[in-house]
């Protein structure tokens, strides 16, 4: 999906109001030092790509963040204020239901949503000179 | 499996108000999204409302300011408030709930027409 025609401010207040809440709601408990930020992206729409990817891609060692209230509030962010961004989830969904999967808090999903917290931050500053 | 049934839908005047309701029945969770799609002739279904189990909403700019959504997990029923319609609101409106399997949008009702015109 190719995020260039999203509403961005929308999807940042989206954020600012309740998203940010639920990635420090799941990140209680850890030191802010204790990851590395190792994603990075360019501006708005690469920024999504990677929060999609991270937040919605099954990877090794954290099995999913899909049903954490922060990817929910996210991913209806997206449907809301992306043209057509709806459609192509309804569809993904069904291939979704048949994979259904334990709901575990590793360190890996930790560290994962420690980046998450780090891209958001970059898409909320897109004037911002990348490092 | 969960079971949703809508209802509320008709035929109502510009600047009218409709009420739509969504009953839920079946295996009910605790961490949920709820919301209401609508779909008109020869357009792409759009989410227009959302709301969250810890009781945050999410809104198209569209129906920002007219339309309230809102839920009683008593009743495991949500409800969308549609007030000021403008003919643009004409659509089939379906509720859809997720967050059990997928944590998107798992289990959609039939649907419920809503006509806006004098």
């Known amino acids: 999906y190719d995020f260039t025609n999203c509403d961005f401010e929308k999807i940042k207040a989206a954020y600012l109001s309740t998203i940010s809440k639920d990635l420090i709601t799941y990140m209680s408990g850890t030191k802010s030092t204790e990851f590395n930020n190792t994603v990075s992206c360019s501006n708005r729409p690469h920024c999504l790509t990677e929060i999609q990817s991270l937040t919605f891609n099954p990877t090794a060692g954290c099995a999913s963040l899909a049903k954490e209230m922060f990817a929910m509030k996210t991913k209806a962010a997206l449907a809301i204020w992306c043209p057509g961004y709806s459609e192509t989830q309804i569809n993904a969904t069904q291939a979704m239901k048949k994979r259904r999967k334990r709901k575990v808090t590793t360190n890996k999903c930790l560290e994962q949503v420690s980046q998450l917290q780090g891209l958001w931050r970059r898409f909320n500053r897109p004037l911002l000179k990348q490092q | 499996e969960v079971q949703l049934v809508e209802s509320g839908g008709g035929l109502v005047q510009p600047g009218g108000s409709l009420r739509l309701s969504c009953a839920a029945s079946?295996?009910?969770?605790?961490?949920?999204?709820m919301g209401w799609f609508r779909q008109a002739p020869g357009k792409e279904r759009e989410l227009v409302s959302a709301?969250?189990?810890?009781?945050?909403?999410l809104y198209a700019d569209s129906v920002k300011g007219r339309f309230t959504i809102s839920a009683d997990n008593s009743k495991n029923t949500a409800y969308l408030q549609m007030n000021s319609l403008k003919p643009e609101d004409t659509a089939v409106y379906y509720c859809?709930?997720?967050?059990?399997?997928?944590?998107?949008?798992?289990?959609w009702g039939q649907g419920t027409l809503v006509t806006v015109s004098s």
């Open positions: 859809a709930k997720g967050g059990y399997s997928s944590g998107w949008f798992d289990y």
């Open positions: 709301i969250f189990s810890d009781g945050s909403t």
């Open positions: 079946g295996n009910i969770f605790s961490r949920y999204i």
